[in-house]
């Protein structure tokens, strides 16, 4: 297949191609679909994916997808080595670690082999899309009397995350909920001995390494009170 | 469907600056990617400036650190600052709008808008 791969030099469209509606005088007036949005994740910088909707398609195409960094000794353009299926047709393409790079502009362009005028290059910061593991290892320690504390870990830097930490008792309806920032820690000033309590933890990338919106998943809960073990009332361990 | 209009162009002495406005009507621009292209005489479109509606903006290499792109969606408005205009500079700015499902989605090639101005043009003499 011959396809035009266009070079990161900020100029990554030059010629007048397809327009859906109004365009400048001078365009082509050829109207085609446009090519699905990319939607990139960076996975506790471990991995990234990057996807695409492959059903929006009006027939099954094997999109090709290559990418740069911008303005960086990465700026040569890759080909995707790992493509993603969906019922035998692309739908997205896994970069491993050593291809992402953080702090620089990542440029991914989507384009259809039959079509090679019909492409779309899209720019994205990579700190503002990393989603961290869950927390786990949670732990309780009790204080005193009435007071607990939540511990927790997560397999990456700490200073990069804050938390959000749930709770509730089995006579509540709905979770209170604590912001924490990175010391992933979280106390109870007063605790109702007489009541069992849940707790989970998620964390978001956000804010001193990047701006992502998405949180982790949520840990396994942990529970304590009335209905936990009583061997040892000062520690009690994760409960899946 | 959402309109586009430029403002803002000029004749300006290098080293000048320029603020152009983009205003849309017919449609929010709360979840559309937006983008600055300019053309001068003779040469492509290219790409200028682009941001997403979640926030996040990008440069071409020409104009990084000289031009900032802004919106206010409460004005259903985009803008590009424009300082240090070089002659170079001189060309018809388009501004062009692609809806968009996610927050980080951001163009910077010309094919992936469906709306476009008319343009607006600026001159820097030297």
């Known amino acids: 297949l011959n396809t035009t791969i266009l070079t990161p030099n900020g100029n990554e469209d030059t010629t007048a191609d397809f327009f859906l509606t109004t365009m400048p005088t001078d365009s082509l007036s050829v109207s085609t679909l446009p090519l699905p949005e990319v939607q990139c994740f960076v996975f506790n910088v471990e991995y990234m994916n990057c996807t695409w909707n492959s059903s929006s398609e009006p027939q099954p195409t094997n999109l090709t997808l290559h990418y740069w960094y911008k303005n960086s000794d990465n700026d040569k353009v890759q080909k995707c080595s790992h493509y993603l299926f969906s019922e035998e047709i692309t739908s997205g393409c896994q970069l491993q670690k050593k291809e992402i790079h953080l702090y620089q502009t990542f440029v991914v362009q989507l384009q259809d082999p039959r079509e090679p005028r019909r492409q779309a290059t899209q720019m994205l910061k990579l700190q503002n899309l990393v989603i961290p593991w869950a927390p786990e290892n949670l732990t309780l320690h009790k204080l005193s009397e009435s007071q607990l504390e939540l511990n927790w870990n997560n397999r990456f830097l700490n200073h990069c995350l804050e938390h959000l930490v749930q709770y509730r008792t089995d006579w509540d309806h709905s979770w209170t909920e604590q912001s924490v920032d990175y010391r992933h820690k979280f106390s109870l000033p007063s605790v109702d001995g007489q009541k069992r309590y849940t707790f989970r933890v998620r964390s978001r990338f956000n804010p001193l390494c990047g701006s992502a919106q998405h949180w982790s998943e949520w840990s396994h809960p942990i529970h304590w009170g009335s209905n936990t073990s009583k061997e040892n009332p000062f520690l009690f361990a994760l409960e899946a | 469907q959402v309109q586009l209009q430029e403002s803002g162009g000029g004749l300006v002495q290098a080293g000048g600056s320029l603020r152009l406005s983009c205003a849309a009507s017919?449609?929010?621009?709360?979840?559309?990617?937006m983008g600055w292209f300019r053309q001068a005489p003779g040469k492509e479109r290219e790409f200028v400036a682009a941001d997403s509606w979640g926030g996040d903006t990008f440069y071409a290499d020409s104009v990084e650190g000289r031009f900032t792109f802004s919106r206010d969606n409460a004005k259903n408005a985009v803008y590009l600052q424009m300082n240090s205009l070089q002659p170079e500079d001189t060309a018809v700015y388009f501004c062009?709008?692609?809806?968009?499902?996610?927050?980080?989605?951001?163009?910077?090639?010309?094919?992936?808008?469906?709306?476009w101005g008319q343009g607006t043009q600026v001159t820097v003499s030297s």
């Open positions: 062009a709008g692609a809806p968009a499902s996610f927050a980080t989605t951001a163009y910077s090639s010309s094919n992936s808008y469906s709306y």
């Open positions: 017919g449609r929010t621009l709360s979840r559309v990617a």
